[in-house]
Amino acid sequence: EEELQVIQPDKSVSVAAGESAILHCTVTSLIPVGPIQWFRGAGPARELIYNQKEGHFPRVTTVSESTKRENMDFSISISNITPADAGTYYCVKFRKGSPDTEFKSGAGTELSVRAKPS
């Protein structure tokens, strides 16, 4: 069986300030079992944007029903975008465990923010 891939089809996305940004992510397999998390940045200081399991993410919603067992679409929408939201966002698959361990990351989607149309 082929190893799971994390696919972020958009290298970049440009959104007007005040709009919502949709960041696409799909996985190619249900195995291994474990959650998806979204991060801004790729280094040790990366910021947690969304955790499928738990947490407080008031501006983030999932595009599909990510809690369904057979779901392979982990795209998210971030509302009310501001210039401070610019950066590269990574969709990351974790392997279930104690603690969960990082399994594979998508290639990243760079979000840029345009001025609000007048």
Epitope: F39, R40, G41, G43, P44, A45, R46, E47, L48, I49, G55, H56, F57, G87, P99, E102
Partner: antibody, heavy 117, light 108 residues
Framework: DVQLVESGGGVVRPGESLRLSCAAS????????MTWVRQAPGKGPEWVSL???????YYADSVKGRFTISRDNSKSTLYLQMNSLRAEDTAVYYC???????????WGLGTLVTVSS | EIVLTQSPGTLSLSPGERATLSCRAS??????LAWYQQKPGQAPRLLIY???SRASGIPDRFSGSGSGTDFTLTISSLQSEDSAVYYC??????????FGGGTKVEIK
């Protein structure tokens, strides 16, 4: 408003231990990496340690094996356990929030650690 | 580890004058250089990042420039409240995160 409040500093002898705490408020603590930065008298800031959002830890070579960083997301609190303290560890220790692009955007007021015989 | 060297060590200028502070990196950091201001008894405060972007709430008399290894912080018209020590930090590489040794700005 973001607030970071350090505690636990004091005067100790070489070889002794101290545990610093940093109480955070005004942001979702669990979503951000957190760091300790120290500043010896009359010197520039020196990064000490970082704990990531997934609890992975990183240390400056000068403290590796002696200091341990940890976080309790349920209490929005950052810790630094400092063992085998040396005179050269004397400094003000700041807790600082770090951004995804490696900027120290919020700092506490600091807590003074003095190591002296 | 990237070493940051700041010059001069001290700058003594009159109110209204222009202050030019330098930071040199031991290897290229692209545009990923930040500047912090620290007043006595206070923690450092982020002023500039990405070489030239002002942090939130920072007055426009503060500006940054440079790329690669050579960077400059300019205070266009010094005010008494700008008396402080200024530090550069590279935010290109991780860890360790490194700071320069500082430049003290004194107002005559």
């Amino acid at each position: 408003d973001v607030q970071l409040v350090e505690s636990g500093g004091g005067v100790v002898r070489p070889g002794e231990s101290l545990r610093l705490s940093c109480a955070a408020s005004g942001f979702t603590f669990s979503n951000f990496a957190m760091t300790w930065v120290r500043q010896a008298p009359g010197k520039g800031p020196e990064w000490v340690s970082l704990v990531s959002v997934t609890a992975t830890t990183y240390y400056a070579d000068s403290v590796k094996g002696r200091f341990t960083i940890s976080r309790d997301n349920s209490k929005s609190t950052l810790y630094l356990q400092m063992n085998s303290l040396r005179a050269e560890d004397t400094a003000v220790y700041y807790c600082a929030k770090i951004t995804w692009n490696n900027l120290f955007d919020y700092w506490g007021l600091g807590t003074l650690v003095t190591v002296s015989s | 580890e990237i070493v940051l060297t700041q010059s001069p060590g001290t700058l003594s200028l009159s109110p209204g004058e222009r202050a030019t502070l330098s930071c040199r990196a031991s290897q290229t950091v692209g545009s990923k250089l930040a500047w912090y201001q620290q007043k006595p008894g206070q923690a450092p405060r982020l002023l500039i990042y990405d070489s030239s972007s002002r942090a939130s709430g920072i007055p426009d008399r503060f500006s940054g420039s440079g790329s690669g290894t050579d960077f400059t912080l300019t205070i266009s018209s010094l005010q008494s409240e700008d008396s402080a020590v200024y530090y550069c930090q590279q935010h290109n590489d991780w860890p360790p995160y490194t700071f320069g040794g500082g430049t003290k700005v004194e107002i005559k």
